[in-house]
């Protein structure tokens, strides 16, 4: 049955009407409007933008638009005492200092309140010492240094290149290795694509460009001072010593011009292999310390940033559902930026704005969605997903009972090559069906579907003729909805060709050069990729809110559960003797997955056949679909990560951006051969298999016939 039957409206008010109303020119105009000045979280400028969005969403026709404010811990540089790094000689004189700001891009020279590059939430400090180059500062990089090269980072300042993993994981790894400071830099190998000019002449990172970003290890906690609860007017706040996830050592980011000056003098051990070499004309020696002539020189950090409890504002818009107003489909993306936010987040915010306008237009013509749609402009995402998390904490009881789906809407583009989707398996079929109905914007695919160009350019590694859809990790505002609350979630954006472009993210990420002109000149002059992303995100929201039967296919979960069980079993089987010695068996997990597969299959058969005109039965079947994601939540959470509660997926413990499957078992098995107490370690593996098997079985039973 078609979507519009849900609300008995005229046939023209269907998905096509919604999609046809979306216009590239509007997205372009909104992006320009959102990117003329910085909108740093906690600032007056970002509050004014929140009020502007509130006013415009009301004009567009939403039923209500409210600001939801919270007082959360943020971090800012000291305006009179700038952060920098120096090389000091044996007398303590500073013979080289890193730059205090990025050279502003053309046309923005007179813009005030551009926050200089800094690592948000770095503690204050002025450590000095020898430098150790730690590559990307990944877990495996420290293993290589400490175990293979016998290099001790204790009491050293480490310098790490950005890329591969979330910067907070880099800092955590450095802390665990005993470092007393961390310098983060962007290496051209990762942030300068060959054959492309630097901004403003191209989309590459200039030598003075620097990536800002938070360095927290929140593990889903939200505001560091109020974990688990909203940072409202009567909140009880932890002391700073008990705050969640704050780094304990000073951290500062620099560009590759400054990095060159630090790295060119490095002595000590040679890099272990070519994977430790970037593209600068330096030896990439690991250290510790400088070479021969410079061996008496040290590196000194000067960090004076402060942590401050500051008010932030979410904008929450509501379009009430006509039939099931107590079922919520949420479209959310953040508004705060590090500087201008040309890509992150305003390329996403502009798309949300146009989606709201299109829904509002339909509503003004008498249409309503079957279910309620909530639109959110989140604040303080860049400071640890704070706005979305605090709002979800405040509304958790409503969300866990009423939340159907969450669609994330941060940056619409990180390239212009093909579509990229990460989502729950429940949404695979929705995404496939939708992209088959949308036109591809790609050159060479005129008249072809988005599904076809996406599948050609980004094929699934497992299923031929299908596109790659990735696991949800974290590092964005879906985290609390999916990982903590178990609300089916998804995200979509246009991306680069990962095979030919090895750089991490896009080169100008979180720099001052992320401007409107970057997008308009180099990434998407016609805004056709933005429009396609608007169609995907908006189309998903439309179907989720309007289809009579929720567009979730539980059979796709069964398929991936089997794949994930096979994968974790094969990891465990690298230790065959220990599995015998400690009686480790995966039989319970495979049995649960088999049961899930059979029950999901039977449920899908019933879904085809039931009487959709019976509102009680319809609601019952939809509730089973809605609550399936919720059934994968363990109320006790993962070990040492209580706000990551999804048993099937969690952000990797080694890279917040990446998703890991069966994370409890995975972490229990990780580096198990280095655990000094094997009996205890394998006991934890067995416990995690038990938790996973129980959870999969319990989830399966939610799909069984109710009586």
């Amino acid at each position: 049955k078609s979507s519009n039957e849900a609300t008995n409206i005229t046939p023209k008010h269907n998905m096509k009407a919604f999609l046809d109303e979306l216009k590239a020119e509007n997205i372009k105009k909104f992006l320009y409007n959102f990117t003329q000045i910085p909108h740093l979280a906690g600032t007056e400028q970002n509050f004014q933008l929140a009020k502007q969005i509130q006013s415009q969403w009301k004009e567009f026709g939403l039923d209500s638009v409210e600001l939801a404010h919270y007082d959360v811990l943020l971090s800012y540089p000291n305006k009179t005492h700038p952060n920098y790094i120096s090389i000091i000689n044996e007398d303590g004189n500073e013979i080289f200092n890193t730059s205090l700001f990025e050279p502003p891009p053309p046309g923005y020279e007179n813009v005030s309140d551009i926050v200089p590059p800094f690592s948000a939430f770095s503690p204050q400090g002025m450590p000095e010492g020898d430098l150790v180059y730690v590559n990307y500062a990944r877990t495996e990089d420290f293993f290589k240094l400490e175990r293979d090269m016998k290099i001790n980072c204790s009491g050293k300042i480490v310098i790490a290149r950005y890329g591969k993993v979330f910067r907070g994981n880099k800092v955590k790894n450095a802390q665990l290795a005993g470092a007393k400071g961390v310098i983060l830099y962007s290496d051209p190998a990762d942030y300068f694509a060959p054959g492309v000019k630097s901004y403003p002449d191209g989309w590459n990172l200039p030598g003075g460009g620097v990536q800002r970003g938070n360095i927290l290890n929140l593990n889903g906690a939200g505001d560091p001072l109020t974990p688990g609860y909203p940072a409202n007017e009567y909140a009880y706040r932890r002391g700073i010593a008990e705050a969640v996830g704050l780094p304990s050592i000073p951290v500062h980011p620099i560009g590759y011009y400054d990095a060159q000056k630090l790295l060119e003098k490095m002595g000590g051990s040679a890099p272990p292999d070519s994977s430790w070499r970037g593209s600068l004309k330096v030896p990439y020696n690991v250290g510790p310390g400088f070479t021969g002539n410079f061996s008496t020189q040290k590196v000194k950090m000067h960090i004076h940033s402060t942590n401050e409890v500051t008010r932030i504002y979410n904008v929450i818009g509501t379009l009430r559902g006509a039939v099931e107003p107590d079922r919520y489909v949420i479209l959310g993306g953040h508004r705060d930026s590090w500087v201008f936010g040309g890509i992150d987040p305003q390329s996403g915010a502009a798309v949300v704005h146009e989606i709201v306008r299109s829904f509002g237009t339909l509503k003004k013509e008498g249409w309503r969605p079957r279910r309620t749609i909530l639109f959110a402009s989140w604040d303080a995402e860049e400071f640890g997903l704070l706005g979305s998390t605090e709002w979800a904490e405040e509304n958790s009881r409503l969300l866990q009972e009423r939340g159907v789906a969450y669609i994330n809407a941060d940056s619409s583009i990180e390239g212009n090559y093909t579509l990229r989707v990460d989502c729950t398996p429940l949404m695979y079929s929705l995404v496939h069906n939708l992209t088959k109905e949308l036109k591809s914007p790609d050159e060479g695919f005129e008249g072809k579907s988005l599904y076809e160009s996406w599948t050609k350019k980004s094929p699934s590694p497992e299923f031929s003729g299908m596109p790659r859809i990735s696991k949800l990790g974290s590092g964005n505002d879906f985290e609390v909805f999916f990982q903590r609350l178990g609300i089916a979630s998804g995200r979509a954006r246009y991306t680069k060709n990962w095979e030919t472009n090895k750089f991490s993210g896009y080169p100008l990420y979180h720099s001052v050069y992320e401007t409107y002109e970057l997008v308009e000149k180099f990434y998407d002059p016609m805004f056709k990729y933005h429009l396609t992303v608007a169609q995907v995100r908006g189309g998903m929201v439309f179907e989720l809110a309007n289809s009579i039967v929720l567009p979730f296919d539980c059979r796709d979960y069964a398929v991936v559960l089997r794949k994930y069980a096979d994968k974790i079993y094969s990891i465990s089987m690298k230790h065959p003797q220990e599995m015998k010695t400690y009686s480790v068996s995966f039989d319970s997990l495979f049995s649960a997955v088999k049961n899930f597969t059979e029950i999901a299959s039977k449920f899908s058969e019933r879904l085809q056949d039931f009487d959709k005109s019976n509102p009680i039965v319809l609601r019952m079947m939809n509730d089973q679909l809605m609550f399936l994601e919720r059934a994968f939540i363990d109320p006790l959470g993962l070990p040492d990560r209580p706000f990551y509660r999804h048993v099937i997926y969690a952000p990797s413990s080694h890279n917040k951006y990446a998703g890991e499957s069966f994370p409890g078992i995975y972490d229990a098995l990780f580096d198990i051969e280095s655990k000094v107490d094997p009996s205890k370690a394998w006991g934890e593996v067995k416990r995690q298999i038990y938790v996973a098997a129980f959870t999969v079985q319990a989830a399966a039973e939610t799909l069984s016939e109710v009586a």
């Epitope: 175990r147 204790s154 690298k574 230790h575 220990e578 051969e673 000094v676 107490d677």
Partner: antibody, heavy 117, light 108 residues
Framework: EVQLVESGGGLVQPGGSLRLSCVVS????????MSWVRQAPGKGLEWVAN????????YYVDSVKGRFTISRDNAKNSLYLQMNSLRAEDTAVYYC??????????WGQGTLVTVSS | DIQMTQSPSSLSASVGDSVTITCRAS??????LNWYQQKPGKAPKLLIY???SLLSGVPSRFSGSGSGTDFTLTISGLHPEDFATYFC??????????FGQGTRLDIK
Amino acid sequence: EVQLVESGGGLVQPGGSLRLSCVVSGFTFNNYWMSWVRQAPGKGLEWVANIKKDGSEKYYVDSVKGRFTISRDNAKNSLYLQMNSLRAEDTAVYYCARDIMATIIDWGQGTLVTVSS
Amino acid sequence: DIQMTQSPSSLSASVGDSVTITCRASQSINNYLNWYQQKPGKAPKLLIYTASSLLSGVPSRFSGSGSGTDFTLTISGLHPEDFATYFCQQSFSTPPITFGQGTRLDIK
């Protein structure tokens, strides 16, 4: 159950050679560093040598460098210590041991090497 | 190389007593210190790793503490089977792995 069983000890004259063997079971041998540790009669423990999982790295205490060679055969779950140019001060019980991050978590029962004329 | 010095080299105590053995490293080893128990004619057994972590199956009357250069092993309420020789060992800077000279615990 984890087991490490040494063999090859005995009486040898100064300057002579001996090869110690250790066969392990109960853990996946090729995932672990292995060590030899010795204990002279009535004395303390002295680490002798260790070898990486794949045999690519080997380390020795200064007093045995150039005389002893540690090796392994992962296919046979076996660890070896070839001892040449033996001296009276090498007399000790030699233990084969599983070494996790330089922590000795499992020990064999030991094999006695006596160097005497 | 890091030297490990244990004290006392021997001590006598009675069943039910609590005893403390100390171990000092010649330089900071953070918390990379292990304690072993050895009975006559037997191989040593690991008791405590990373200064204070009790190995599975080791009775809770054994505890370890310390960091940097100074460490202690405490046995609270001696049992007859606890009379043995105890060795500390550093796993911070290796090779070489180095042990203390041992502390013999006898029945008074």
